[in-house]
């Protein structure tokens, strides 16, 4: 039922145009010498969105986009120089695109940038309180950014910084062939993975990293990479993508002898994100394009949303996949995949598996192995030679809870919100897409929390030309959702409710959780408001119940509750 | 200079027990594995067990699992073998040797332990 | 477990000569062999490391070569104190285990 026909025609569908005279959007359209708007850093502690782009990094006030600060950062005309005589395009490469944009420290970000094929970093200072109004480079203190950010303005970077470190998988070099996950910054001897072995990375796309805890003890904390990749021979036939989950103990040093300045817990498993075909042959969405995680209440198991698109050119399609940490972690305790020579199938390992397992964090409180660099050499051995798993991890309900395959365009960022509703909790996704379009989509448990119907609420065009969304943060301070592409950044709010009607049933079949009819209008829903006054009903749409002539009040008094 | 002296070697009756220690000296004693190999008379090199840095964990081949356990106190810079459930075949001289996370670089001069039925 | 065939048991050499010593393991342990020298009455001592790695005070006429399954030891030019018994050591896996030996003796 994840492409029930009705539910796939949006409910609203509004254009740029009508967005702008319903106020429902406010774009920067960016600046004639700038582009690329893809890095985003949300601060809502300061109300600021801190957006790197061709040398240029932003601060926009989170209230209204057209308030903004900017620096320019731009490459040294020698550097361009270099860089055009190696061949490169003067506008589309040979500039400062800026790939990573972190908050450093109270009173600073870090920033990397693709230098004119030169990586470079710096540091912004932004005060320490928002009203100290500062947004200014450090001009004395730029640091090298290879490892950091890629050469190639047409690559990503996943990164994350954590404690003073920097997490990132990139492109090391000039060619763009040695991608690898680094820990760079901080006091220790930067780390990487291992080089030219394609049973590590084998041409990675980087999507994203995220710290998650393991357990309550720090020690067991992980980085996790979402990545999509070449499928390694003989795991495939013919080539494929696979997307990727990796994992990094963050307490990781290297090894001892082997392994040393390399990870010693990475391991890889792949993400299946597929619909039943015909024939029994699986329809995969294997592409990987974002992944949003959406914690609640139980930061080591957040809910993973994965957006995934086709591999083919032929079938063209779009899929939003979730996937529980707990599926994950049992994939990283289960077999290893091995194979005896490089014309061999892969196999799950059978074999004697060393203690500690690897891929497990070193902490006193597991057999007192303090440190990666205390692990037998079997340990690294087997690490090196095993870093992926056999089985795969499937998503919740083993199939996408969205899939769109008629449609001329491909989903490729995804946010999510949790909305409380009248009847219970919604995750509410806004999907970005490759021609400058958001849905709005709620997914609403039926029988079972694991069985999900997917309402299409709205579509919106955000730009004005048809433009890839590649950046999408949503401020639940401010109820506001941002969007980058290469044109400029768009503001518009979660929620638009008078937009649905001026009648209490076309609020209610809506079934958006952000809105109910308070007897006059239909208006943003509130939990703390006063029940009576509000007429609601996500899981059903039913107006007949909400909204019957016995008015609101009477209806209230015998409503069941969903939860 | 690297030192390690063997003690507690003896004569024990079939099934008895024997507690084995070595003094380690010359070097930070908690930064190594530490591990014990032993030589029946005429015979080769045998490998008995090897505990980590921290002590909080010990490997064993399947010859002595069970009734062997080797521990460490970083204190006292002193390394132990617990000899359990004694057979004919673990009469031998034990050697107590640094390292076992990589090659055993030095060895102690060993001490004999003799099991008689 | 892994085990390691040294051979020849005995080799027979006169001073001055070279000698080859050779350890096979029974599966692939990369470059994990170590080999020790042993003499009468004495505990092993280390000679080389991760197959091919020299150890301060000991003879440059020693040297290892290998990996895989195939190991060598090799004394250039063989003194009167090298003779002894020569074990190798996988440390790839555990269980670590020694290789029966091979004693080089004066011909």
């Known amino acids: 039922n994840y492409q029930n026909g009705k539910n796939n025609v949006p409910r609203l569908k509004l254009s740029y145009k009508e967005m702008l005279e319903s106020n429902n959007v406010i774009t920067f359209n960016g600046l004639a010498n700038s582009s690329s708007y893809h890095t985003f850093l949300l601060d809502e502690e300061r109300s600021r969105l801190y957006v790197g782009a061709k040398d240029h990094i932003f601060s926009f006030n989170l209230v209204n986009i057209k308030d903004f600060q900017k620096i320019v950062w731009p490459v040294s005309y020698t550097r361009r120089d270099e860089c055009k005589w190696a061949g490169k395009d003067i506008l589309k490469e040979c500039a400062n695109f800026i790939k990573v944009l972190k908050a450093y420290n109270q009173t600073h970000l870090y920033a990397c940038g693709t230098g004119a094929f030169h990586p470079i970093c710096t540091y912004i200072e932004i005060g320490h309180h928002p009203e100290d109004n500062i947004f200014k480079l450090e001009n004395s203190h730029f640091e090298n950014g290879r490892g950091k950010s890629p050469y190639d303005p047409k690559l990503l970077t996943a990164s994350l910084l954590i404690d003073g470190e920097l997490y990132s998988g990139t492109a090391a070099d000039f060619m763009g062939r040695d991608f690898a996950i680094f820990r760079t910054l901080g006091h220790h001897h930067p780390i990487r993975t291992e080089q030219h072995d394609s049973r590590w990375l084998n041409d990675p796309r980087f999507i994203s990293a995220h710290l998650i805890p393991e357990s309550d003890n720090p020690e067991d904390d992980k980085v996790y990479f979402f990545f999509r990749e070449n499928a390694i021979d003989g795991e495939h036939s013919g080539k494929a993508t696979h997307a990727r989950i990796g994992q990094i103990c963050k307490n990781d040093f290297g090894g001892h002898r082997s392994l040393v300045n390399k990870w010693t817990t990475f391991l890889k498993a792949r993400l299946i994100c597929s619909v039943p075909g015909p024939n029994g042959i699986d329809t995969h969405f294997d592409e990987l394009q974002d992944v949003f995680l959406m914690n609640f209440k139980d930061p080591k198991n957040p809910i993973v949303y994965g957006v995934f698109t086709t591999s083919s050119n032929i079938f063209k399609g779009s899929a939003v996949c979730m996937y529980s940490m707990s599926d994950v972690r049992r994939v990283f305790l289960g077999p290893y995949a091995h194979r005896d020579g490089p014309n061999y199938q892969w196999v799950p390992y059978q074999g004697r598996v060393p203690y500690p397992r690897p891929g497990t964090c070193p902490s006193k409180t597991f057999g007192g192995f303090d440190s990666t660099k205390d692990l037998p050499d079997d340990v690294i051995t087997f690490a090196r030679s095993h870093p992926a798993m056999y089985n795969p991890v499937f998503p919740i309900n083993n199939r996408p809870i969205m899939i769109k395959t008629d449609v001329n365009y491909q989903f490729t960022q995804i946010v999510v919100d949790r909305v409380d509703a009248e009847d219970g909790q919604y995750d509410v996704m806004f999907i970005g897409t490759d021609v400058g379009t958001v849905l709005k989509v709620v997914s609403i448990p039926k029988e079972t929390w694991h069985d999900l119907e997917e309402v299409l609420l709205e579509e919106m065009t955000v730009f004005r030309e048809p433009t890839t969304i590649s950046a999408m943060e949503l401020s639940t301070k401010q109820q506001q959702l941002y969007i980058g592409s290469t044109a400029g950044i768009a503001q518009l709010p979660l929620h638009r409710c008078d937009i649905y009607g001026k009648a209490c049933a076309e609020c209610c079949l809506a079934r958006d959780p952000y809105c109910a009819w308070d007897g006059s209008s239909c208006s943003r829903y509130f939990p703390t408001a006063k029940a009576r006054t509000r007429a609601q009903d996500i899981r059903n749409g039913d107006p007949l119940t909400h909204c019957s002539d016995g008015g609101i009040e009477g209806r209230m008094d015998h409503h069941h509750h969903h939860h | 200079e690297v030192q390690l002296v063997e003690s507690g070697g003896g004569l024990v009756q079939l099934g008895g027990s024997l507690r084995l220690s070595c003094a380690a000296s010359?070097?930070?004693?908690?930064?190594?594995?530490m591990s014990w190999v032993r030589q029946a008379p005429g015979k080769g090199l045998e490998w008995v067990s090897t505990?980590?840095?921290?002590?909080?964990?010990?490997y064993y081949p399947d010859s002595v699992k069970d009734r062997f356990t080797i521990s460490r106190d970083n204190s006292k810079n002193t390394l132990y073998l617990q000899m359990n459930s004694l057979r004919a075949e673990d009469t031998a001289v034990y050697y107590c040797?640094?390292?076992?996370?990589?090659?055993?670089?030095?060895w102690g001069q060993g001490t004999t332990v003799t099991v008689s039925s | 477990e892994i085990v390691l065939t040294q051979s020849p048991a005995t080799l027979s050499l006169s001073p001055g000569e070279r000698a080859t010593l050779s350890c096979r393991a029974s599966?692939?342990?990369?470059?994990?062999l170590h080999w020790y020298q042993q003499k009468p009455g004495q505990a092993p001592r280390l000679l080389i490391y991760?197959?091919?790695q020299s150890i301060s005070g000991i003879p440059a006429r020693f040297s290892g070569s290998g990996s895989g399954t195939d190991f060598t030891l090799t004394i250039s030019s063989l003194e009167p104190e090298d003779f002894a018994v020569y074990y190798c050591?996988?440390?790839?896996?555990?269980?670590?285990?020694f290789g029966g030996g091979t004693k080089l003796e004066i011909k």
């Open positions: 050591q996988q440390g790839y896996s555990f269980p670590y285990t």
């Open positions: 040797v640094k390292g076992g996370q990589g090659a055993m670089d030095y």
């Open positions: 991760y197959a091919s």
């Open positions: 599966q692939s342990i990369g470059d994990y």
């Open positions: 505990i980590i840095k921290s002590g909080g964990y010990a």
């Open positions: 010359g070097f930070t004693f908690s930064s190594y594995y």
